[in-house]
């Protein structure tokens, strides 16, 4: 099995990869269904994973305009890749006190993706900080 530090590194790679996927999708905002989606912003501490889950559950969809449909659909599906149970457990710990997905302001795809990227950056920063200070919870 992966060592703890290897796992931490892979986790960081995955989170950064999600940012790259968001950036790629931002190139195709005009090919996305212009639907308003719950987009968490200024997420309170310990509710990051809950907000992350809200972004993953959102029905971001290709407008099926043809040209970029394949890369959009592949990218959206990769954005929904489930993190491992250890992180799910951390989310569970705070689930009862975090806002529901429906309570977040709804935004069109462009702003939705920008807010998702912002959350991912925050989570990466927190993860790095927790590693620096020797904390296990990220």
């Amino acid at each position: 099995h992966k060592s703890s530090s290897q796992g931490q590194d892979r986790h960081m790679i995955r989170m950064r990869q999600l940012i790259d996927i968001v950036d790629q999708l931002k190139n195709y905002v005009n090919d996305l269904v212009p639907e308003f989606l719950p987009a968490p912003e200024d997420v309170e501490t310990n509710c990051e994973w809950s907000a992350f889950s809200c972004f993953q559950k959102a029905q971001l969809k290709s407008a099926n305009t043809g040209n970029n449909e394949r890369i959009i659909n592949v990218s959206i599906k990769k954005l929904k890749r489930k993190p491992p149970s250890t992180n799910a457990g951390r989310r569970q710990k705070h689930r009862l006190t975090c806002p529901s997905c429906d309570s977040y302001e709804k935004k069109p795809p462009k702003e939705f993706l920008e807010r998702f990227k912002s959350l991912l950056q925050k989570m990466i920063h927190q993860h790095l900080s927790s590693r620096t200070h020797g904390s296990e919870d990220s």
Epitope: K2, Q6, G7, R10, H11, I13, R14, Q17, D20, I21, D23, Q24, N27, N68, R70, I71, N73, V74, S75, K77, K78, R81, K82, P83, P84
Partner: antibody, heavy 126, light 106 residues
Framework: QVQLVESGGGVVQPGRSLRLSCAAS????????MHWVRQAPGKGLEWVAF????????YYADSVKGRFTISRDNSKNTLYLQMNSLRAEDTAVYYC???????????????????WGQGTTVTVSS | EIVLTQSPGTLSLSPGERATLSCRAS???????LAWYQQKPGQAPRLLIY???SRATGIPDRFSGSGSGTDFTLTISRLEPEDFAVYYC???????FGQGTKVEIK
Amino acid sequence: QVQLVESGGGVVQPGRSLRLSCAASGFTFSSYGMHWVRQAPGKGLEWVAFIWYDGSDKYYADSVKGRFTISRDNSKNTLYLQMNSLRAEDTAVYYCARDGDSSDWYGDYYFGMDVWGQGTTVTVSS
Amino acid sequence: EIVLTQSPGTLSLSPGERATLSCRASQSVSSSYLAWYQQKPGQAPRLLIYGASSRATGIPDRFSGSGSGTDFTLTISRLEPEDFAVYYCQQYGSWTFGQGTKVEIK
């Protein structure tokens, strides 16, 4: 070691069908998306089809859409390409390739085709 | 759909020289989505670079990738005899390949 071996190529008449197979070994087949890529004689690489690790989604190049079907049997570690209504322009070496981005969060994360088979030749001729 | 245009079509160089291959995309590509492959005659392609600049496992450090947006470059710092081959760029997700650049011995 990690390996992909294609089979099923041959000479076939236009309009007929052929099924290619790709046997995978040395890795957890069910954790990886898989591709078919082809190369016509003296030409460049052309992506043909992709199937998600669990078979839940499939994508095709416009040139084969409606004629070719990609499928997989994870219990047999095997990828397939069913080719119907074959045309002369389908003549090529067909490669299966592993998608480098594993479904496992802690697995491989390469956005590219990181393992390739040796290829099998399909000739469509009357 | 995105089109990847590689240049030059053929590059004639001597061993020890530096090779610079270009790949231009018709629309912006996130760096993570750009890969480079090497193919020698009669062989399957081999992944060289993923994420525009990361070397795949076992690839020597004379190979390097760079670029962002629509312009990407593969550089071979000092050509070895085994490097003479055809090189392809590819956009991940659409899986479109460029038409290839042949690096041949001068």
